[in-house]
Amino acid sequence: NEGSVTGSCYCGKRISSDSPPSVQFMNRLRKHLRAYHRCLYYTRFQLLSWSVCGGNKDPWVQELMSCLDLKECGHAYSGIVAHQKHLLPTSPPISQASEGASSDIHTPAQMLLSTLQSTQRPTLPVGSLSSDKELTRPNETTIHTAGHSLAAGPEAGENQKQPEKNAGPTARTSAT
């Protein structure tokens, strides 16, 4: 259904091979990426509320597909926020976490409970924040607590964890 307005290969925005996206735009794509669909000549990337397409052979397209395949994009994306480094102390983090397999959590109550009760946390180096993750499944239930999304999805356990307890009083968490 390439070119179809309603199909998985409809494009909201086409990016020409001659003018690849900027670094800033790529970071935005990484953060909001939910899924991709391989079409005949191009790949369609589904974002939070819009879509963007690029040629199958374009390096940035290959990079984004690989990023989602490895779950380093989308809801899993942390991002490096340089201007927020002052929020965290300079003491080294204590490594204590493992990701949780929370993909089987579906109801809002369960998701909230899981996030609030979770004790398994990823170890993030100083200067990183783990909140404000994007969702990966369009049909997944979402609830918001203190302005942050709590979502279920592949490796959601990794992404909804709070920063370390010893990360400092000003470090934001994904559930308050």
Epitope: N27, R30, L33, R34, A35, Y36, E63, M65, S66, C67, L68, D69, L70, K71, E72, G74, A76, Y77, S78, G79, I80, S95, A97, S98, E99, A101, S103, D104, P122, T123, L124, P125, G127, S128, S130, T136, R137, G153, P154, E155, G157, E158
Partner: antibody, heavy 118, light 113 residues
């Protein structure tokens, strides 16, 4: 060709420390999610640790059995990963494999043997 | 954690036979983001590291003979080895990489009848 070469294994006593390394080549290292997997003699495979890529702040994750004792780090400029193992226990005795998860598959090294014995 | 249940634990075969190894996961390994199944199959011979045969449940690693076929989706997966040869005698493991911690099946030992 893709290569992962582990080094640094050896015989240590319980409660001692050891740092093992893995040198990678033949693929875009900075884009790979790196893991350590171990295999005790005559046993199955057990995941040990994972480190994410730079855009995700090199976040690390550990198996419950090693949490608080092992530290995983990477150096993208050298295409190297390291596993610092402290307070070693006899049950940590195993062949330790470095693995690289890429979209083209999961690559494994030949392993380095860590023996913890008094 | 996702539990991987592999069967049978051992299998005695004759050269030329076709064998099937099953792997079942406690939850779906199909990721909606890319419609890929996060399952791999490995072959391990004594004294060697595991060798990747299949990834994304059905994609054969380069250099792996086409007699190795991976199939299945969701929670049920199969490794089929057609016309088994002597060099195929080894332990075979399935592994999920859908979620951390990665988990492995208990292994299937392929022996000569």
């Amino acid at each position: 060709a893709v290569q992962l070469v582990e080094s640094g294994g050896g015989l240590v006593q319980p409660k001692e420390s050891l740092k093992i390394s893995c040198a990678a080549s033949g693929f875009t290292f900075s884009n790979a999610v790196m893991n350590w997997v171990r295999q005790a003699p005559g046993k199955g495979l057990e995941w040990v640790a994972r480190i994410r890529t730079k855009p995700n702040n090199y976040a690390t994750f550990y198996a419950d059995s090693v949490k608080g004792r092992f530290t995983f780090s990477r150096d993208d400029s050298k295409s190297m990963v390291y596993l610092q193992m402290d307070n070693l226990k006899t049950e940590d005795t195993a062949m330790y494999y470095c693995t690289a998860w890429t979209t083209e598959g999961i690559y494994w090294g030949q392993g380095t043997l860590v023996t913890v014995s008094s | 954690d996702i539990v991987m249940t592999q069967s049978p634990s051992s299998l005695a075969v004759s050269a030329g036979e076709t064998v099937t190894i099953n792997c079942k996961s406690s939850q779906s390994l199909l990721y909606s983001g890319n419609q890929k199944n996060y399952l791999a199959w490995y072959q391990q011979k004594p004294g060697q590291s595991p060798k990747l045969l299949i990834y994304w449940a059905s994609t054969r690693q380069s250099g792996v003979p086409d007699r190795f076929i991976g199939s299945g989706s969701g929670t049920d997966f199969t490794l089929t080895i057609s016309s088994v040869q002597a060099e195929d005698l080894a332990i075979y493991y399935c592994q999920q990489y859908y979620d951390t911690p990665w988990t492995f099946g208990g292994g299937t030992k392929l022996e000569l009848k």
